[in-house]
Interface confidence: low
């Protein structure tokens, strides 16, 4: 691939990061949110096949709007096909910030025994694995995925007594659901899909992340 | 407490070496890009280089091709290796730290809140 | 590259005394922008980033303001230790520029 090809897909990916990052809640600048291509390459280079810009120099950190200290890495490793030595590197950096979230953009995917440690390592730090293909576009732009808003307890306690249900009659949603996982939504919680509809002006379900 | 202490500096001819070197210490410095910037007598502030934390690097076309820039993260020290020295170069040197990690990268930009006390060079004969 | 024009260049004024100066973009840098000081034999030291944000422990008389092309650093009330050299700096993209100084 040539340094423009990846040039451009290296802003997509990050751009699209960052749109994941605001719309999990973080704190990211619209400047960051708008940045063109141009000020992509004037910020980190244009020819990634001398190093300009490496993988690693793409990495993000950035906090939470209801709490600057819930922070989130975001890492971009350099090996095509990411192993468990890389995963350690990254859990000792977090040990040392004392993050406990991160996103891990791979280029081909994860090795069994790295996928493992993502597993092992859960709740204390929570590795989410992403691969750049995902991110070439940002799903939740597309124009057949409805929008999804994440519930909190408390509106979830209201929606059960007001139709007078339990947590488990709710429809289901996969914690593997590509919309699911863009927005970090964990298993139990429960989500809300807001659809157009020509007879109701938007039409409205709820489903619980299993 | 951060610091930044500079050192390697002193006299060299034109056409000469030399290395500097800023130890760093009260931060993660591996997380951390990291700036040489310079003040030539009498001048303002020149920005020189800067090395990523994930070791991108980036240079000011007045020293492109002589100046490299380096960072060791287990010794938590950056370098810049000089060479083909010339008059103009004659200047303070300070080693600067972003006051946001990852930056160049990420949701920060290059804003320098610690920086060293500075390692005097001159290039004469 | 990204120049910085600053001014005024120099200019004479007494404690107490409200103080501006400004920096512009050669294009549009956004509100990617810092202020430093500097005084002889010591660090420059930051001020202000992000155009407006004042850094931590530097005392409220300065502000910053401005964006895209035109920003201005103003001290409200000068001070004894004030009396400096201050640099605007661009933090759009590299190579990193600075302007000469005011």
């Known amino acids: 691939m040539d340094d423009e090809e990846e040039t451009y897909r290296l802003w997509k990916i990050r751009k699209t990061i960052m749109q994941l990052c605001h719309d999990r809640g973080y704190l990211v600048t619209q400047d960051e949110l708008d940045q063109t291509l141009e000020e992509f390459k004037a910020q980190f280079g244009d020819k990634p096949s001398e190093g300009r810009p490496r993988r690693t120099d793409l990495t993000v950190l950035v906090a939470h709007n209801d709490d600057p200290t819930d922070q989130m890495f975001v890492f971009f490793p350099e090996e095509p096909k990411v192993g468990i030595k890389t995963i350690k590197v990254y859990c000792q950096r977090m040990q040392e910030e004392n993050i406990t979230r991160a996103l891990i953009v791979v280029q081909q995917g994860m090795t069994p025994s790295a996928k493992q440690s993502l597993v092992d390592m859960a709740p204390k730090y929570i590795l989410e694995q992403f691969l750049q293909q995902e991110l070439l576009i940002n799903i939740t732009e597309h124009e057949l995925v409805p929008e999804h808003v994440v519930m909190t307890k408390e509106e979830v306690t209201e929606l059960l007594a007001r139709y007078k249900l339990r947590e488990n009659q709710l429809p289901r949603i996969q914690a593997g659901d590509p919309v699911a996982r863009y927005f970090g939504i964990k298993r139990g919680q429960v989500v809300k899909i807001i659809r157009p509809s020509e007879t109701a002006g938007r039409y409205i379900t709820y489903r619980l992340v299993q | 407490e951060v610091q930044l202490l500079e050192s390697g500096g002193g006299l060299v001819q034109p056409g000469g070496s030399l290395r500097l070197s800023c130890v760093a210490s009260?931060?993660?410095?591996?997380?951390?890009?990291m700036a040489w910037v310079r003040q030539a007598p009498g001048q303002g502030l020149t920005w020189i280089c800067f090395?990523?934390?994930?070791?991108?690097?980036h240079y000011a076309e007045s020293v492109k091709g002589r100046f490299t820039c380096s960072r060791d993260n287990s010794n938590n020290t950056l370098y810049l290796h000089m060479s083909g020295l010339r008059g103009a170069d004659t200047a303070k040197y300070y080693c600067?730290?972003?006051?946001?990690?990852?930056?160049?990268?990420?949701?920060?930009?290059?804003?320098?809140?610690?920086w060293g006390q500075g390692a005097l060079v001159i290039v004469s004969s | 590259d990204i120049q910085m024009t600053q001014s005024p260049s120099s200019l004479s004024a007494s404690v107490g005394d409200r103080v501006t100066f400004t920096c512009r973009a050669s294009q549009n840098i956004r509100n990617n922008l810092a202020w430093y000081q500097l005084k002889p034999g010591k660090a420059p030291q930051l001020l202000i980033y992000?155009?407006?944000s004042l850094e931590t422990g530097v005392p409220s008389r300065f502000s910053g303001s401005g964006s895209g092309t035109d920003f201005t650093l103003a001290i409200s009330s000068l001070q004894p230790e004030d009396f400096a050299t201050y640099y605007c700096?661009?933090?759009?993209?590299?190579?990193?520029?600075f302007g000469q100084g005011s």
């Open positions: 600067a730290k972003p006051n946001s990690p990852f930056t160049g990268s990420g949701s920060f930009h290059n804003y320098f809140d610690y």
């Open positions: 009260g931060f993660t410095f591996a997380s951390y890009g």
């Open positions: 992000s155009a407006s």
């Open positions: 700096q661009q933090a759009h993209g590299f190579p990193i520029t």
């Open positions: 090395v990523g934390s994930g070791d991108t690097t």
